[in-house]
């Protein structure tokens, strides 16, 4: 067959409509004309094109092609002529003030905040050179400059991640069923069963030493005693493979030694050697029958009609002549649309093609990052470029702790808590919010003062039973919480001053809650008999179930606002899964009884997902797109529960519709709640009243008794419509008509007595500090039987 990319020797042929005929008579899709790509391969599709001027935000390649300015000198050639990465272009590049130069031999600029963060972002590691010691006196500084509590040094675990905390340690004695690598040389301890198992477990390979294992070392090519049977070949890397696999063209040994030292040209003179090394009779070469296993005896045989010589066979790109007929194929990044024409593959249809933004181009795609993030050119992931270093904040029943994700230093934010499970943060104000199940209170404090019991403000300390989930709406300044004892979901202003029950029906065991103030939605998990994940507007409108199948004990949920996906952990199914905000595109990222023994809290940031696990008493992380790269961030944590990321990019600024309105608080007398932004016609907010009051016909003022009006109806999230006469205390949709798409009717429980002899701050009996059962059932015993209640938590 002829060169498939050459065309035009045959008679002229008209191209189909929607195609452009090249000078060489190839046919290409018309849309490829004047797109700055030589698709014809004779440049005729790019001739006589109007001169293009690049935008100010673009870089003009030497050949006139336009690319984004930010792609210049990014280590990848985007200009067809490579001029965006040329020495001339990049050496004259000066890094802006907020960027750091990677040194004189590099033209790369990285965000200044990446300096001394423990990750080498410059090729030569210039961003990590000469960094000062950051660790406190009682901490150990790892080789990668992360900080570690001194207790973790020489404990047998690689806590630094680079092994530096375990170097130069006094040799611990190996256990009774362990083997010391390197003999008396002070090597690591490995299980005895790993010795002489044909796998190198010791760095010095001493566990497979010939004198120890009673056989030649794994380096021998094929010593008879090296493998169990004579029909096996001993790889130099220690394993045994089938003898027939030796010199068969496939690399079966880890070190490929089964294909080393193989004789070349082993076929006889009357034989043809196939591509895979096997031999067939020479007469079978080019006999129009495939005799070699790989078909190489018929490759390159010229006979019959070569359709590719005529108009490239009608193929838009590659034409391959076959024994019978021909075949059109496409270069990388393209796929056949109609057996002949190649069209671009939209790699961006795969939601995991990029960590953030995917931009599809003809024949390739490019990953980009949202504002505030920058592409790490080494990992190709988007990393936070702005603000302080991110940290993880988590609860462990009696404390709230913090781990700096860059320096890896570990601190206690709030000590001496009775039974804290849920928490959240407000980054802009540097505040932390938490619920204590024993005190039955929701608290708040400034992060730097949170350890001081005098500074812990009480937001909610009435009509609270078991607040297990908490979320802060940082835009509209509200807190939302679930109460598994009262079986309610409520909202209050961040100072606790104004509150309302949003849902009091169809909740069994509500647990985690998360909010999306940018779009006006909240999401929560319920691990009751009919376990589910639900969603509604932040005003309680449009309640819907997102997940109800293949779900058992959904504990933590978290939102990735950028990719618009919800992640959750299921402690019964031992799974970490995600869905989009509409409940579609469900993915199980990790399914593991080891890493997800009893997961509780979950958080997402950059390219990672983090979760707490009660049984492992640890915090894990993994790649949020594919669930790979699972690692332990912290262990021996004693009941780690809720977990959040503290970083400004987790809480993007957005307008508060209630404050943007002409009247303060949206004109609402009590609560102004954001409405879900379902369409461009969606109301921006609705007004709401306390649980014991009713909204008037103006949809703004609150009244002790329902106002009689024929025009006002309440559309309940449960029953859709109720007559005006049975109107409940309500929230409203702010519209010109009095259509009240409201929350469900709260069930008004008996009033709490005004005088109680003993406050709801039950004592802790040590026996009930941990979950009620050893296998971490979903229930906790609340620590005071006098209160007559149990608090449930995973």
């Amino acid at each position: 067959a002829a060169d498939p990319l050459l065309g035009g020797q045959g008679p002229a042929k008209d191209c189909e409509k929607d195609q452009f005929q090249c000078r060489n008579e190839r046919c290409i899709p018309s849309v490829w004309r004047c797109d700055e790509d030589d698709d014809c391969l004779d440049h005729s599709d790019e001739d006589d094109c109007p001169k293009k001027t690049c935008a100010d935000s673009d870089f003009t390649c030497d050949n006139g092609h336009c690319i984004h300015e930010r792609w210049k000198c990014d280590g990848e050639e985007e200009c067809p002529d490579g001029s965006d990465e040329s020495e001339a272009t990049c050496t004259k590049q000066v890094c802006p003030a907020e960027k750091l130069s990677c040194g004189p031999t590099s033209h790369k600029c990285v965000p200044a905040s990446w300096r001394c963060d423990g990750e080498k972002d410059c090729e030569g590691g210039a961003d990590e050179a000469g960094c000062a010691t950051l660790c406190a006196p009682h901490e150990f500084q790892c080789g990668n400059r992360s900080c570690l509590a001194a207790v973790f040094v020489c404990d047998g675990d690689d806590d630094c991640g680079d092994g530096s905390d375990e170097r130069g340690c006094a040799d611990p004695a190996c256990g009774p069923r362990e083997f010391r690598c390197g003999g008396d040389g002070g090597g690591a301890c490995i299980p005895e069963r790993w010795v002489c198992d044909r796998q190198f477990d010791c760095e010095d390979r001493s566990d497979e030493a010939a004198e120890l294992c009673g056989r030649p070392g794994p380096g021998a090519t094929s010593a008879p005693a090296a493998c169990a049977t004579a029909s096996q070949f001993a790889c130099r890397s220690g394993e045994c493979v089938h003898l027939g696999w030796r010199c068969d063209g496939d690399r079966d040994c880890k070190d490929k030694s089964d294909e080393a030292d193989c004789p070349l040209g082993t076929c006889r003179g009357d034989e043809f050697q196939c591509g895979d090394g096997t031999c067939v009779l020479a007469i079978k070469h080019c006999n129009q029958e495939q005799d070699c296993p790989d078909g190489s005896d018929e490759a390159g045989c010229l006979q019959g009609l070569n359709e590719c010589l005529h108009n490239n066979g009608g193929c838009s790109h590659i034409c391959t002549d076959l024994k019978i007929g021909f075949e059109c194929t496409c270069p990388a990044g393209f796929q056949l649309l109609d057996q002949k024409t190649c069209g671009d593959i939209d790699e961006c249809k795969d939601p995991d093609a990029c960590s953030q933004i995917c931009v599809n181009y003809k024949g390739y795609f490019k990953c980009e990052c949202y504002p505030g993030y920058e592409m790490d050119l080494l990992t190709k992931n988007c990393k936070a470029a702005a603000g302080k270093s991110p940290s993880l904040i988590f609860t462990n029943r009696h404390e709230v702790r913090r781990i700096d994700l860059v320096k890896r230093n570990y601190s206690r934010l709030i000590p001496m808590l009775k039974n804290v499970v849920a928490l959240d943060v407000e980054v802009a104000t540097n505040r932390i919010y938490w619920c204590d199940l024993s005190y039955r209170k929701i608290y708040s404090a400034y992060m730097d003062k949170a350890s001081d019991p005098k500074e812990q403000e009480v937001l909610i300390d009435e009509q609270l039973h078991s607040p297990e989930g908490l979320a802060v709406d940082w835009v509209h300044k509200h807190i939302y919480w679930t109460d598994s004892g009262n079986k309610t979901i409520s909202v209050a202003t961040v100072d606790g001053g104004r509150r309302r029950t949003l849902f009091s029906r169809n909740l069994s065991e509500p647990r985690a809650i998360a909010v999306d103030p940018l779009r006006g939605f909240m999401y929560w998990s319920d691990w009751g008999d009919q376990a589910k994940i639900e969603k509604s507007g932040l005003n309680g409108v449009d309640r819907q179930t997102l997940v109800s199948d293949n779900i058992e004990w959904p504990n933590g949920i978290t939102l990735d606002l950028l990719s618009q996906r919800l992640y959750w952990v299921d402690s019964k199914l031992h799974q970490l899964s995600s869905i989009d905000f509409s409940g579609g595109n469900r993915k199980t990222l990790i399914s593991s009884t080891d890493f997800l023994s009893h997961p509780f809290g979950i958080a997402v940031f950059e390219d990672k997902v983090f979760w707490t696990d009660l049984e492992n008493e640890a915090i894990f992380s993994a790649n949020r797109l594919n669930g790979l790269e699972i690692s332990i961030l912290a262990e021996n944590l004693n009941n780690p529960h809720d977990i959040v990321i503290f970083h400004e990019l987790k809480q993007p600024r957005a307008p508060d519709a209630c404050e943007l309105s002409v009247q303060p608080n949206g004109g609402c007398e009590y609560l102004c709640l954001p409405a879900p932004q379902i369409s461009s016609h969606s109301p921006k907010y609705t007004c709401a009243c306390p649980d014991t009051m009713w909204l008037g016909p103006d949809m703004k003022r609150c009244y002790r008794a329902p106002q009689s009006t024929s025009t006002t109806t309440l559309a309940s999230t449960m029953t859709r419509t109720v007559p005006a006469t049975t109107r409940a205390p309500g929230t409203t949709v702010h519209r010109s008509t009095y259509q009240n798409h409201s929350t469900e009717t709260p069930s008004l429980t008996a009033a709490v007595p005004s005088s109680v002899s003993v406050p709801r701050a039950p004592s802790i009996s040590p026996s009930t500090l941990s979950p009620a059962t050893s296998n971490h059932s979903q229930h906790y015993a609340n620590e005071d039987s006098k209160m007559g209640s149990t608090v449930t938590a995973a």
Partner: antibody, heavy 117, light 107 residues
Framework: EVQLVESGGGLVQPGRSMKLSCAAS????????MAWVRQAPTKGLEWVAT????????YYRDSVKGRFTISRDNAKNTLYLQMNSLRSEDTATYYC??????????WGQGTLVTVSS | DIQMTQSPPSLSASLGETVSIECLAS??????LAWYQQKPGKSPQLLIY???SLEDGVPSRFSGSGSGTQYSLKISNMQPEDEGVYHC?????????FGAGTKLELK
Amino acid sequence: EVQLVESGGGLVQPGRSMKLSCAASGFTFSSFPMAWVRQAPTKGLEWVATVSTRGGHTYYRDSVKGRFTISRDNAKNTLYLQMNSLRSEDTATYYCIREGTSLFAYWGQGTLVTVSS
Amino acid sequence: DIQMTQSPPSLSASLGETVSIECLASEDISNYLAWYQQKPGKSPQLLIYYANSLEDGVPSRFSGSGSGTQYSLKISNMQPEDEGVYHCQQGYNYPYTFGAGTKLELK
């Protein structure tokens, strides 16, 4: 700066009533539970009552239950203690307190209540 | 209610001396213990919370220790301004209760 100023103390006959007030300033009054603690002359300290942030929950020591009522007005940043059926053993300096978690964080200067015929 | 037994009821110390005051709870209070100093004619001031955390502005010669049911307040290098009554208070469970107080005088 946190300031708590008590008023309303004085001499009162047994069986009569008296109302103490406490004006709070320098902090978000509605964000903290408030309490009254008393100290009889040359005696130790004794917790009397606590009120929750919005006034919905009140807690009392057994000896004053049914006679004393603690309340608050968040709009006025004021704490109250209504004392009825006063007894001679109620004689003490009464301190207005901003509670902290598990402790009494800030104390007023105190107001003396003397129950005597 | 949890009873708090404080000892001694009173003690006197010389300038620069180290003194200790003990507080015994009738049940485990898990370090939810605070110490207050009350000077004559004044209201009590918080010194130490959570058994061993020093309140801001309190001199470092004051220190708290203990766990379970037994706690102590130590004042090293006694100063004239340290005279007064010291109270312990448990915050583990309502009703919060105080010890009877210890009167500290300068010799």
